[in-house]
């Protein structure tokens, strides 16, 4: 039986390259059944998650997922780490998994890994 | 509504090369990662690699290492996937498929490019 | 690489049947509770459909007829009232670890 709980699709290890300077949208895809929960995104610190309070975000839908974006507008250079979605669903709390922007600094754009490396590098699928 | 239409069939010596295009449209072509699957006549499907929305990310089966290039121009909502060194085993349907919630699933396919490999 | 084993490779069915398919993985497409396993549908020169993603969630505009279920190693498919227009054949499909890998199908045939 399909699970009525609110679900967060973010897969374990997941990562974006992106370029500062660059807008960027970092999505939390989130399964629910009646109300939309609330969800919030933070950004890793050591053991801590700091909520990101003042930040814009947005939901569209996709099929039967509605996604929570983070914006990024534009991608800055301290921008660089590990996020994770949090929702709030009947006084219960679901994190998602944490996913990591690598930001390349426009300056620095051609120390990016090349497609090969890349390519030879497999855990970096997705991410 | 989301579509994926791919180029017709093919016909290929042994040791040619084949390029097959999927153009992409109703929905967001460079906001999802792309894959390509093939089928053998009468048998299973077969995964052979992955491509990001923004080619930072390009991941090859190593059966198909070397031989196997996968590129999009997300300019003009295509993808292309090209195979080199063509022998008759490589003689099947060619699938691309949109990549759902960042690496869960193959939510919508192409119709699928029939390669045929012979002397 | 992790090979799925689909059984049984065809059945025999009539409208109406419960049509259960399972799928064993040689090793765990788990991680941190969530099941990398999908399911999809093929019919003859066409391409596969998405019935069911991450082990049991019922693709959009899936029928509520099928449902998947399974963690771990072992995953199954089931066809609660097998209709005409579901005659085909299945794919477990595990997302886990890359390569990502098929199972061999269940080819599901009108008795």
């Known amino acids: 039986k399909e699970s009525c709980d609110v679900q967060l699709y973010i897969k374990r290890q997941s990562e974006h390259s992106i370029l500062a300077g660059d807008p960027f949208e970092l999505e939390c895809p989130v399964k629910y059944c009646a109300n939309r929960p609330h969800v919030t995104w933070c950004k890793l610190n050591g053991t801590t998650c700091v909520k990101l309070e003042d930040r814009q975000t947005s939901w569209k839908e996709e099929k039967n997922i509605s996604f929570f974006i983070l914006h990024f507008e534009p991608v800055l250079p301290n921008d660089n780490g590990s996020y994770r979605c949090s929702a709030n669903f009947q006084s219960n709390l679901i994190e998602s998994h944490s996913t990591t922007l690598y930001v390349t600094d426009v300056k620095s754009a051609s120390e990016r890994p090349s497609k090969d490396e890349m390519a030879s590098r497999p855990w970096l699928l997705y991410r | 509504q989301v579509q994926l239409v791919q180029s017709g069939a093919e016909v290929k010596k042994p040791g040619a090369s084949v390029k097959v295009s999927c153009k992409a449209s109703?929905?967001?072509?460079?906001?999802?990662?792309m894959h390509w699957v093939r089928q053998a006549p009468g048998q299973g499907l077969e995964w052979m690699g992955y491509?990001?929305?923004?080619?930072?990310?390009?991941y090859y089966a190593d059966k198909f290492q070397g031989r196997v290039t996968m590129t999009r121009d997300n300019s003009k909502n295509t993808l292309y996937m090209e195979l080199s060194s063509l022998r008759s085993e490589d003689t099947a349907v060619y699938y691309c498929?949109?990549?759902?919630?960042?690496?869960?699933?193959?939510?919508?396919w192409g119709q699928g490019t029939t390669v045929t490999v012979s002397s | 690489d992790i090979v799925l084993t689909q059984s049984p490779s065809s059945l025999s069915a009539s409208v109406g049947d419960r049509v259960t398919i399972t799928c064993r993985a040689s090793q765990s497409i788990d991680y941190d509770g969530d099941s990398y396993m999908n399911w999809y549908q093929q019919k003859p020169g066409k391409p596969p459909k998405l019935l069911i993603y991450?082990?049991?969630n019922l693709d959009f505009g899936i029928p509520a007829r099928f449902s998947g279920s399974g963690s771990g190693t072992d995953f199954t498919l089931t066809i609660s009232s097998l209709q005409p227009e579901d005659f085909a054949t299945y794919y477990c499909?595990?997302?886990?670890?890359?390569?990502?890998?098929f199972g061999g199908g269940t080819k599901v045939e009108i008795k």
């Open positions: 498929a949109r990549d759902w919630l960042r690496g869960y699933a193959m939510d919508y």
């Open positions: 499909q595990q997302s886990n670890e890359d390569p990502w890998t």
């Open positions: 109703g929905f967001t072509f460079s906001s999802f990662g």
């Open positions: 491509i990001s929305s923004g080619i930072s990310t390009i």
């Open positions: 991450a082990a049991s």
